[in-house]
Amino acid sequence: PPNRRTCVFFEAPGVRGSTKTLGELLDTGTELPRAIRCLYSRCCFGIWNLTQDRAQVEMQGCRDSDEPGCESLHCDPSPRAHPSPGSTLFTCSCGTDFCNANYSHLPPPGSPGTPGSQGPQAAPGESIWMAL
């Protein structure tokens, strides 16, 4: 039988807003990844910032509802925004436990679907809600 969905939880320092209220944090100790049990969905998300071929995780946690993409078994990120010149935010949604721990691959920043120069711009740390 299914369990309540459990996702990796992470919020980079300086990120504005929190998705902590979308679940209940499990007491996992220090060495293990932080885990959150989703309250309102069966869907995890992840956001990575790709700058000069280096991907840095910005946020991981529970989505506030089940929506397209949540049926995915794995985290397959797609480009969403350019928070600053030379960096691209990639987000994924997926619907298995801890599926947001890692991404399967990141498409190149210039691939189809990437917002162009007219796409949304934001200061670092303010881009997250656009991505969600």
Epitope: P1, P2, N3, R4, R5, T6, E24, L26, T28, L32, P33, A35, C38, L39, Y40, S41, R42, D66, T96, D97, F98, A101
Partner: antibody, heavy 113, light 112 residues
Framework: QVQLVQSGAEVVKPGASVKMSCKAS????????VSWVKQSPGQGLEWIGE????????NFNEKFKGKATLTVDKSTSTAYMELRRLRSDDTAVFYC??????WGQGVLVTVSS | DVVMTQSPLSLPVTLGQPASISCRSS???????????LEWYLQRPGQSPRLLIY???NRFSGVPDRFIGSGSGTDFTLKISRVEAEDVGVYYC?????????FGAGTKLEIK
Amino acid sequence: QVQLVQSGAEVVKPGASVKMSCKASGYTFTDYWVSWVKQSPGQGLEWIGEIYPKNGVSNFNEKFKGKATLTVDKSTSTAYMELRRLRSDDTAVFYCTRQRDYWGQGVLVTVSS
Amino acid sequence: DVVMTQSPLSLPVTLGQPASISCRSSQSLEYGDGYTYLEWYLQRPGQSPRLLIYGVSNRFSGVPDRFIGSGSGTDFTLKISRVEAEDVGVYYCFQATHDPNTFGAGTKLEIK
């Protein structure tokens, strides 16, 4: 087919520890939570906690924190539960389950001096 | 902790007759994701528990269709349309909506 095979019965003295195993086969071990359940003699069932083998994250019934430790060995698809500081009221059958759908045969732990 | 109250605690039934077991929870078992994490198990004498029903009404693979789960919120029922000899044992309801997960005290079904 899915199988969970647990280790044999144990007789232990009060204050001692015991570690039991639960070997899984017939499915991808890292994709399902392993839960542990206690059944005291002639009593009902009590949920102890669960562990996700892929990353070792566990979730406990507060009552069993400090009493039970859950671990896994991914290389052998085996889950373990260690019970420490055993008392007579820890005498019970302990079951492992694959996310509650398939169950092991149980391990009888008898705490007696 | 969420208390799961089963009734009756003992259920003598004639073979071929229907049987019904009630389970009430002290809090609603509908979770924020819309799913109700309510399950039913049968423990035959000398055996491990066996999953019958999950998500209130979904039969687990291999479970005969004479087992029917229903209910919502705090009130749940397991019905057996025609009791067979192999149905003897203790039936437990279980909730995985709230931590800690909890079982009912069990209902012992026996043949009259």
